[in-house]
Amino acid sequence: PEPPTACREKQYLINSQCCSLCQPGQKLVSDCTEFTETECLPCGESEFLDTWNRETHCHQHKYCDPNLGLRVQQKGTSETDTICTCEEGWHCTSEACESCVLHRSCSPGFGVKQIATGVSDTICEPCPVGFFSNVSSAFEKCHPWTSCETKDLVVQQAGTNKTDVVCGPQDRLRA
């Protein structure tokens, strides 16, 4: 028969014949011959290959370097890479999560709209009228001004986006 010019899925063409690719988690040792199938062997400890392949070397699992604030979120297998995330209070600087930075804090006058995760930074928003934040925090939302009326008090000092209102007793001299 004519030697093939193309091969089926999960095969590759070598020396005018179609050989099976190695399955995920295994590397190529030797191509198939007319007598034997492709020779594949398992990836070693801390190695992986995540596709059908003809790689002669497995890839090393990613190292989650604690010196960069990283920790293991999901341990790698022979078919998957290790997934890193950041230590508490830190988040990844990129999608690949190769290093971490400290979560940003929201300054006074701003509150936390979305708390940071291992992969995203804190999202801050300005405190709208009626709300304030007097601290720099990565967790605190804007707080509503105190309602003096519900305490039978009156506003003595107006609130700002950074300060609460100051309530005081009602002026008893007024009729």
Epitope: N15, S30, T33, G44
Partner: antibody
């Protein structure tokens, strides 16, 4: 069809080194590993190590670590096995074979270590 | 790693079946489905007759069969012929790019 042709017999003195060659023809040289196996007279097979011609990476059996070196020359499709600090008990037939599976073998090279 | 354990000898009459065992550990035979068997006639290089536990290279007769259970692999030669008289070796992948052989079994056809 892959063919492996080895160099000829050698006689060596204790303490010296020997270098055996294994020339491959047929197939793509860089697409299969080469294992080295030895067999002392009247004894069984002993795996010594392997070399991956595509990158030249090697893996040696613990017993031979520090004494064996496997190299390759892609221009001549040849791999080499060098064994140093020879002792009389290294007298054996040395074989090269294709892959870990060893589905094709060289004809063998007799190395005699004698004073 | 130490050698796999094979019986030093086995025998059978023509037409009979004979089984050769190959015992390893949970780090080699038990851990991987990468057991091979070789036949070696005196003065010749070994010849692969079984790979990946039970597969036969094209051209190897189906009189040669093999299996594995736990840490032990087995080779069965059925319908014994005079030319089957040879040494038989098993090998197993042992992880980390290492391979280990059995000590060999001399098969005699009576």
């Amino acid at each position: 069809q892959v063919q492996l042709v080895q160099s000829g017999a050698q006689v060596k003195k204790p303490g010296s080194s020997v270098k055996v060659s294994c020339k491959a023809s047929g197939g793509t040289f860089s697409s299969y590993a080469i294992s080295w196996v030895r067999q002392a007279p009247g004894q069984g097979l002993e795996w010594m190590g392997m070399i991956n011609p595509s990158g030249g990476t090697t893996s040696y059996a613990q017993k031979f670590q520090g004494r064996v070196t496997m190299t390759r020359d892609t221009s001549t499709s040849t791999v080499y096995m060098e064994l140093s600090s020879l002792r009389p008990e290294d007298t054996a037939v040395y074989y090269c074979a294709r892959g870990f599976r060893m589905d094709q073998w060289g004809q063998g090279t007799l190395v005699t270590v004698s004073s | 790693q130490s050698a796999l354990t094979q019986p030093p000898s086995a025998s059978g009459s023509p037409g009979q079946s004979v089984t050769i065992s190959c015992t390893g550990t949970s780090s080699d035979v038990g851990a991987y489905n990468f057991v091979s068997w070789y036949q070696q006639h005196p003065g010749n290089a070994p010849k692969l007759i079984i790979y990946d536990v039970r597969k036969r290279p094209i051209g190897i007769p189906d009189r040669f069969s093999a299996s594995k259970s736990g840490n032990t692999a087995s080779l069965t030669v059925s319908g014994l012929q005079a030319d089957d008289e040879a040494d038989y070796y098993c090998s197993s992948y042992a992880g980390n790019n290492n391979l280990v052989f059995g000590g060999g079994t001399k098969l005699t056809v009576l």
